[in-house]
């Protein structure tokens, strides 16, 4: 019974960007300004969503699809589809409730966004500090100690930087 | 419809002062941390000052600290920024914003935007 009653629903035949108008014994009726549907068979279209304020319109609102934004310079896009922004810190510091503040002592960021990650523990891997860290840059870790004797190869290209996030404290 | 309106906004001489207002609707006010940001004449957005859901946490960027005063009303859903001696380097369009879903747990991102209201400092 449900099937055929759907074969026969006439709402069934309107197409993306329309409606099928109740009013207007269903028929289909396109979209208003400033709505969309992105399906057939709809019985109403949707608002469109509407990129104010810290958000940019990336793609203009159409019958059949919805506004994208995204965010103005000094922001990027959290979220799924662009939902929030978060304003950008300079590299060398972290957003918190009271702003961009500076990395403190032994940590780094060198991004925009984020939050400030501990250098790299060079000692762990048996290495040492080649580079030192600062506020922007983790440290580069060089040859041991062991490996800058006399005769020994005195230089070794860097060890990769261990994932920050798993840097001890 | 989840919304926000700044009024208040206005000409005033270099350290007069002025209350900006916020009226928010749609959504439950007291439940987000809320936010004003400014835009002077061909820069970009700045972040002035943000409070949590009770009020009992608010912050300034440095340049107004001391001057301007956040604040909120949950029972009448408003969000104000008082301004006092104000400068030239104040005027521009102030917003007020809502905090996401989340904010300050993981993030620190704003999801629903004014229109704004437009602060003018000239003798």
């Known amino acids: 019974f449900e099937r055929t009653r759907s074969l026969q629903d006439p709402c069934s035949n309107c197409p993306a960007g329309t409606f099928c108008d109740n009013n207007r014994n269903q028929i289909c009726s396109p979209c208003p300004p400033n709505s969309f549907s992105s399906a057939g068979g709809q019985r109403t279209c949707d608002i469109c969503r509407q990129c104010k304020g810290v958000f940019r319109t990336r793609k203009e609102c159409s019958s059949t699809s919805n506004a994208e934004c995204d965010c103005t310079p000094g922001f990027h896009c959290l979220g799924a589809g662009c939902s929030m922004c978060e304003q950008d810190c300079k590299q060398g510091q972290e957003l918190t409730k009271k702003g961009c503040k500076d990395c403190c002592f032994g940590t780094f960021n060198d991004q925009k966004r984020g939050i400030c990650r501990p250098w790299t523990n060079c000692s762990l891997d048996g290495k040492s500090v080649l580079v030192n860290g600062t506020k922007e840059r983790d440290v580069v870790c060089g040859p041991s100690p062991a490996d800058l004797s006399p005769g020994a190869s005195s230089v070794t290209p860097p060890a990769p930087a261990r994932e920050p996030g798993h840097s001890p404290q | 419809e989840v919304q926000l309106v700044e009024s208040g906004g206005g000409l005033v001489k270099p350290g007069g002062s002025l209350r900006l207002s916020c009226g928010a609707s749609?959504?439950?006010?007291?439940?987000?941390?809320m936010f004003w940001f400014r835009q002077a004449p061909g820069e970009g957005l700045e972040w002035v000052a943000n409070i949590n859901q009770d009020g009992s946490e608010k912050y300034y960027v440095d340049s107004v600290e001391g001057r301007f005063t956040i604040s909120r009303d949950n029972a009448k859903n408003s969000l104000y920024l008082q301004m006092n001696s104000l400068r030239a380097e104040d005027t521009a369009i102030y917003y007020c914003a809502r905090g996401g879903d989340g904010y300050s747990d993981s993030h620190y991102g704003t999801d629903v935007w004014g229109q704004g209201t437009t602060v003018t400092v000239s003798s």
């Open positions: 749609g959504f439950t006010f007291s439940s987000y941390w």
